[in-house]
């Protein structure tokens, strides 16, 4: 006899990395005949649906119209069905951006190199922080952790061309609160002439798509925005 | 305290070909990538070519590109820049740069001038 249903898909939208002051729905996906969803930041319950009707809804979306620092974290969602509840979603990372300070994103030997070059990214805020992340736009999830006083060192090692795309990084006062994100650098990685062909550029989107591109996660690139279940997952941890 | 010193600079016509050189006073076989900037008067330095080490890789700037030629002697410790088919927009002041690790450029040059004029 099942004890448990099973566990509902959780995602942000438009995307789990909000700017401070903006507004942010986290979406909870879990069966038609739910008859209760319960939200829980940082392990406590933070708010409650009651779809009506019930059977004919299986998504219900919580609406955070103010994102601050206080609001980022871990959030996670389950269900009910009648008596039933469900296994706990994934945790969903939900981070503040635009705090404080813009970091400086530098890279070398330069944003044009051969494939086969040892390349270093570079990301220097001066304010209170030693976390940095390093991010690649476009549907992948690349994304890197560094540690430094004012400045973290990213080294690629050598590059193929599956590296060439647009990098930002962000200084992070805590897992959760990021800065500004620096100015894009875009990385083009030439293939060596004797022995490399140029492969595709990692899909992208436009600059100013920077804040609602998403990451996707071990499940591919799912069309379903219910299926972005462990967006950012691996992001923190 | 690792030196890196240039030399062959001097005013040659346009068309005409020059090889800079770039002694280093440490071994060089084992630092991963040496390089050529240059800079105009009243403007920004800017890379010319670089390679690696180990790897032999070559960058060329696309404006010295099937014109100009790096290589390393490391058995001499010296650097190489060939320039051939030399225009009045090459002149400036060009400097050796040594990246031992491949993070940064460490080690510079003082520079020496090249003045392409007819």
């Known amino acids: 006899q099942q004890q448990t249903l099973p566990k509902p898909f959780i995602w942000a939208e438009p995307h789990f990395m909000v700017p401070k002051e903006k507004q942010v729905t986290i979406c909870c996906q879990g069966n038609y005949g739910a008859v209760e969803y319960q939200l829980h930041f940082e392990g406590s319950l933070f708010a409650v649906d009651r779809p009506k009707p019930p059977e004919r809804i299986n998504k219900v979306q919580f609406y955070i119209p103010d994102m601050n620092s206080r609001m980022a974290g871990q959030y996670s969602c389950i269900y009910r069905v009648g008596e039933l509840w469900s296994e706990p979603s994934n945790l969903l990372d939900l981070v503040v951006t635009e705090m404080y300070d813009t970091p400086t994103l530098s890279v070398h030997p330069g944003p044009e190199v051969i494939s086969g070059e040892k390349v270093t990214f570079y990301c220097r805020l001066d304010t209170a922080t030693s976390m940095f992340l390093l991010l690649k736009e476009g549907r992948s999830s690349h994304v890197q952790r560094g540690y430094g006083k004012v400045q973290a060192e990213f080294p690629l090692g050598p590059v193929t061309t599956a590296h060439r795309g647009t990098y930002r990084c962000f200084g992070s006062y805590n897992n959760h609160a990021w800065s500004f994100p620096s100015e894009p650098v875009k990385l083009l990685v030439t293939g060596d002439i004797e022995n490399t062909s140029l492969a595709p550029e990692d899909p992208t989107f436009p600059a100013d798509t920077w804040g609602t591109y998403l990451l996707t996660t071990e499940t591919g690139l799912q069309k379903d925005h219910a299926l972005w279940d462990h967006t950012a997952q691996n992001l923190l941890r | 305290q690792v030196q890196l010193v240039e030399s062959g600079g001097g005013v040659v016509q346009p068309g005409r070909s020059l090889r800079l050189s770039c002694a280093a006073s440490g071994r060089t076989e084992s630092w991963y990538r040496m390089g050529w900037f240059r800079q105009a008067p009243g403007k920004g330095r800017e890379v010319v070519a670089r390679?690696?080490?180990?790897?032999?890789?070559?960058y060329y700037a696309g404006s010295v590109k099937g014109r100009f030629t790096i290589s390393r002697d490391n058995s001499k410790n010296t650097l190489y820049l060939q320039m051939s088919s030399l225009r009045a927009e090459d002149t400036a002041v060009y400097y050796c740069?040594?990246?031992?690790?491949?993070?940064?450029?460490?080690?510079w040059g003082q520079g020496t001038l090249v003045t392409v004029s007819s």
């Open positions: 740069a040594a990246d031992r690790t491949g993070a940064t450029w460490d080690y």
């Open positions: 390679i690696s080490g180990d790897t032999n890789i070559k």
